[in-house]
């Protein structure tokens, strides 16, 4: 049968599985007269035979691992044994079968890993080989951890890359390995061929002993540093150490302080470089970083905590130059007159800021000294000996010593003796009626004036009136300001009124004095008044959740991609319809129900980014009120602009004839974004035919030089094509043309007879 198993002598390739006993011929070559017999030469290995009449066969099983390809030659001979045809190449490719098991290069491996090493970072490789064809599953190896000893809580601390045999820590291993608990582990690793996928795969195992070493790259304990140290600086306060020598250390101040008073040396010792002030900053948190010689971090940064310890370097300070209190003339012994609160900048709740109060002088000492008492630690002044009489002494001045453990400060207190508070404030009206206001009434508006009077001594705490809203305004939308001269109360709007949440409010006022009432006198109904606030609805425009909405997309997004969305709410709860305004480029559409914004045309960063449009939210129904917000679409660059010449280069010329080769410089640009390093263009001539006359050489990323290779140019214009590649992803190329004229020159300029003025070059080279 001509075709598959027989045919004329020609180059052929056959594929035969290894390991199979011969069961059929390879090929029957047909002789063309005058050829009568065939001869076989080449890598026969005494396996391949050709019979004289052209029958090619093999006589025993092949072994791919011995020879994967047998290169044979078959020639046809005439009756005299002379080659009349060929020899032609016959290639026998031996196809692989899985007849070799994988074997590890070592029966035992040893390695070490540092605790807290990065998960997934290999610290040891196991390696096996398989003589079978790696291009087939027969030689594709699959590594696995069979067992980890010890195994704690069924958690694997180690993992292996199934393809490469790289052993690394798992996340749990990185976090939990501790040489103090378990200094060594043993892994049994298996390797299978057939990519590990077949029941018929061969396998081998090896043992891996792993030592866990301590990671000394640890955050040190928090440091305490006393403020205002007078010791010579810098002072070593702590240290960090990388696991191996040669690390480069640095500190990172995450807080970006104007002055950062710490440094680190190349041993990893950390210093404070100047005295610290706790009152300026009481704690510092910064990071120590270890890098390799190339500046690459060796591990995560360590957090360093420095607490500044307080010393008593601040005296107490008085709340004001003179503190004024009032006391009623019939006030009883022990009554509180007021509290003097001094301050100390030293650390709170420590001895350094713990204050003592002591009265050092009373003037006048009438009717006696020691009329007042101050609580040593609280600073509360009390009446100590008897009730006071205004007509005898209307005012007392006290000098009070305030001290911490090292410093003393004098503070001054003035005590005014006032008439007794035996009259309550009385409202002129108990009901101020109804007041109707629109919900958009301005904040700060006075909406009502209320008045109470008090018959006690004018301009004292006994007659001064404070108005409080005690009912009906839990949101705190209203407030009352008091005129100190007239005790008139002005009810003002402090927060916006809201029809939707409080259409009617029943407000109750209370008028009271800052001074306590005398014993037996109580506030009664006369000190209370009410009014009803009715808020009317105002149809308010929808409110956007942001003034400006911003989104970021790649400029090459597909049409119809959602690029952002906006949200607005209507105070009355109506539906909202969204629309766009100012979409001058016609790039966007908005879903009028949801506010989602989609692209409807190709976007182009180079046309301008961000692209700004206005979004309008309109009430559906109601008064169709609307609000406007901004939508800014930031377009991220893709490399979609080929390089071009940076400017117009018409008018380049050389004076003819050239006395020596000349050159000119040109600049390229493109419209894509070039962050940090700028463009990196490469330049070449646009066609091979130009190479005899011109050469182009790169000067930098944007400029190149075009040079002549000889001086034998005709007197005419040459158009030189230049190929500029931007090296982007994907790389884009522009072919630009530089027109260069060779012309006769007069005084360094091109000379053209009259009538030939068109396109005169103006730049000489």
């Amino acid at each position: 049968q001509e075709g598959k198993f027989s045919g004329p002598l020609k180059p052929m390739t056959f594929s035969i599985y290894e390991g199979q006993e011969p069961s059929q011929i390879i090929f029957q070559f047909k002789a063309n007269p005058p050829a009568v017999t065939f001869e076989l030469t080449g890598e026969t290995d005494n396996i391949f035979v050709i019979e004289r009449e052209g029958l090619l066969y093999y006589n025993r099983a092949l072994d791919r691992e011995t020879r994967s390809t047998h290169n044979l030659q078959v020639a046809a001979l005439d009756a005299n044994g002379i080659i009349v045809e060929g020899p032609v190449p016959i290639t026998i490719k031996v196809k692989d079968i899985n007849d070799n098991r994988p074997t590890f290069l070592q029966s035992k491996y040893e390695g070490s890993v540092r605790q807290n090493s990065r998960p997934g970072k290999p610290f040891l490789y196991v390696n096996a080989t398989d003589l079978d064809d790696p291009a087939t599953p027969n030689g594709q190896l699959y590594y696995q951890i069979v067992i980890q000893l010890p195994m704690i809580n069924n958690v694997m601390y180690f993992q292996i890359n199934n393809k490469t045999g790289a052993i690394s820590l798992t996340r749990e291993g990185s976090q939990e390995l501790n040489p103090a608990k378990n200094p060594s582990y043993n892994l049994v690793i298996s390797v299978k061929d057939m990519g590990g996928q077949s029941e018929n795969s061969f396998s081998d195992t090896t043992s891996v002993d792993i030592i866990v070493t301590e990671n000394i790259w640890k955050a040190p304990k928090p440091v305490e540093m006393v403020e205002n140290s007078t010791d010579p600086h810098p002072i070593k306060i702590t240290q960090v150490r990388w696991n191996d020598p040669g690390a480069q250390y640095s500190l990172v101040d995450k807080e970006k302080l104007p002055r950062f008073p710490f440094s680190i040396d190349q041993e990893g010792d950390i210093y404070v470089t100047q005295p610290l002030d706790r009152e300026e900053k009481d704690a510092y948190v910064f990071y120590a970083v270890a890098k390799d010689e190339y500046g690459k971090p060796l591990s995560y940064p360590l957090e360093i905590h420095v607490k500044v310890k307080d010393i008593n370097d601040n005296p107490p300070t008085c709340p004001s130059p003179v503190t004024v209190f009032e006391v009623q003339e019939n006030e009883r012994l022990g009554n509180s007159i007021g509290t003097l609160t001094a301050h100390d900048r030293d650390e709170e709740n420590t001895a350094n800021s713990f204050l003592n109060y002591r009265i050092v002088e009373q003037t006048p000492k009438l009717p006696m000294d020691g009329l007042f008492l101050i609580q040593t630690y609280a600073g509360m002044l009390q009446l100590a000996k008897q009730s006071l009489k205004k007509q005898d002494t209307p005012q007392y001045n006290l000098t009070i010593e305030v001290s911490d453990k090292d410093f003393k400060t004098l503070c001054f207190v003035q005590i005014n003796v006032i008439d007794i508070n035996d009259q309550i404030p009385i409202f002129e009206k108990s009901d101020y009626g109804n007041l109707t206001l629109a919900e958009d009434t301005n904040i700060g508006s006075t909406i009502l004036t209320i008045q109470a009077t008090d018959a006690d001594e004018p301009f004292t705490g006994s007659s001064k009136i404070l108005y409080h809203i005690i009912k009906g305004d839990s949101e705190g939308r209203l407030g009352v300001d008091t005129d100190p001269h007239t005790n008139t109360g002005y009810v003002i709007i402090k927060k916006p009124l809201d029809f939707e949440t409080a259409a009617v409010s029943n407000i109750v006022f209370k008028a009271e004095n800052p001074e306590p009432l005398v014993f037996g006198v109580k506030y009664n109904a006369s000190s209370f008044a009410k009014f009803t606030l009715i808020v009317t609805d105002v149809n308010e425009a929808p409110q956007f959740s942001q003034h400006v909405f911003q989104a970021k997309v790649s400029e090459d997004v597909a049409i119809g991609t959602k690029v952002g969305n906006v949200t607005a709410k209507d105070p009355e709860g109506l539906d909202i319809s969204y629309s766009l305004r100012g979409d001058t480029r016609g790039w966007l559409k908005i879903d009028h129900v949801t506010g989602e914004i989609f692209s409807v045309a190709p976007l182009d960063r180079e046309a301008g980014s961000p692209y700004r449009v206005q979004v309008v939210a309109t009430e559906v129904g109601g008064s169709s009120l609307s609000s406007v917000s901004e939508f800014h679409l930031i377009l991220m660059d893709v490399n979609d602009n080929p390089p071009r010449l940076a400017k117009d280069y018409t008018g380049l010329f050389f004076c003819h004839p050239l006395s020596a080769p000349g050159s000119l410089i040109f600049e390229a640009t493109d419209d894509d974004q070039h962050l940090f390093r700028g463009p990196h263009f490469t330049f070449s001539l646009g066609s091979g035919s130009l190479q005899n006359d011109w050469e182009v050489s790169k000067i930098n990323g944007t400029h190149a030089r075009l040079s002549t290779r000889h001086t034998e140019f005709e007197e005419r214009e040459y158009v030189v094509l230049i190929r500029i590649n931007d090296g982007g992803r994907p790389p884009l190329e522009g072919i630009v043309s530089l027109p260069v004229t060779f012309c006769s020159c007069v005084e360094g300029s091109c000379f053209r007879p009259a009538g030939h003025q068109t396109g005169i070059p103006t730049v000489g080279m």
Epitope: K562, N565, G573, D575, S577, S579, D591, H592, V593, T594, E596, T618, V620, G621, G622, S624
Partner: antibody, heavy 117, light 108 residues
Framework: QVQLVQSGAEVKKPGASVKVSCKAS????????IHWVRQAPGQGLEWMGA????????SYAQKFTGRVTMTVDTSTNTAYMELSSLRSEDTAVYYC??????????WGQGTMVTVSS | DIQMTQSPSSLSASVGDRVTITCRAS???????LQWYQQKPGKAPKLLIY???NLASGVPSRFSGSGSGTDFTLTISSLQPEDFATYYC?????????FGQGTKLEIK
């Protein structure tokens, strides 16, 4: 009371167009968005698009863009949905529905459109 | 588009039973814009629950809704004869609005 009343059943040939009307009563059409939803025999509900009668703004499901047109006539308080280039798989009941805060609180009674050669 | 998948597609129950229908979204949905509708044969759908858990006007209190993110449920605490119908969830958190494929509730 508030209701939406739709036009009667239609039988159309493939390639033709159909225009279904939806008349609002008991409220003003411009007070709410109008949506169109269809339901093929024995199948679920499929949203086709919406129109804001106040200014004619609309949004259509991608599947129907280019074939559907939603309009309103505020003088007669009526919304319309026109579907062109009809094919047999457009055979369905077409509903109009009014939305408030994006939920469909009032529905028309439905219009059966049959597409058959 | 957000796909809404209801389960089960159909279920048989008896009067008085407590029934729960779930609706899972292919991506997160704002709970303000998740609705449930009831549809009886030959009739237009009827709004049952809006904004995940609010009962529409005139809907009996045995119906309730809950959920957030991608998982939502409709519960009927004690089935009545008039509750046998097909139930649909719908999202309008993002356009296009999409419905679940429906759950047919039949008498056992």
């Amino acid at each position: 009371q508030v209701q939406l009343v739709q036009s009667g059943a239609e039988v159309k040939k493939p390639g033709a167009s159909v225009k279904v009307s939806c008349k609002a009563s008991g409220y003003t059409l411009t007070s709410n968005n109008i949506h169109w939803v269809r339901q093929a025999p024995g199948q679920g509900l499929e949203w086709m698009g919406a129109i804001y009668p106040g200014n004619g703004d609309n949004s259509y499901a991608q599947k129907f863009t280019g074939r559907v047109t939603m309009t309103v006539d505020t003088s007669t308080n009526t919304a319309y949905m026109e579907l062109s280039s009809l094919r047999s798989e457009d055979t369905a009941v077409y509903y109009c529905a009014r939305s408030f805060r994006r939920y469909f609180d009032v529905w028309g009674q439905g219009t059966m459109v049959t597409v058959s050669s | 588009d957000i796909q809404m998948t209801q389960s089960p597609s159909s279920l048989s129950a008896s009067v008085g039973d407590r029934v729960t229908i779930t609706c899972r979204a292919s991506s997160s949905v704002s709970s303000s814009y998740l609705q449930w509708y009831q549809q009886k044969p030959g009739k237009a759908p009827k709004l049952l629950i809006y904004s995940t858990s609010n009962l529409a006007s005139g809907v009996p209190s045995r119906f309730s809704g809950s959920g957030s993110g991608t998982d939502f449920t409709l519960t009927i605490s004690s089935l009545q004869p008039e509750d046998f119908a097909t139930y649909y969830c719908q999202q309008y958190s993002s356009s296009p609005s999409t419905f679940g494929q429906g759950t047919k509730l039949e008498i056992k």
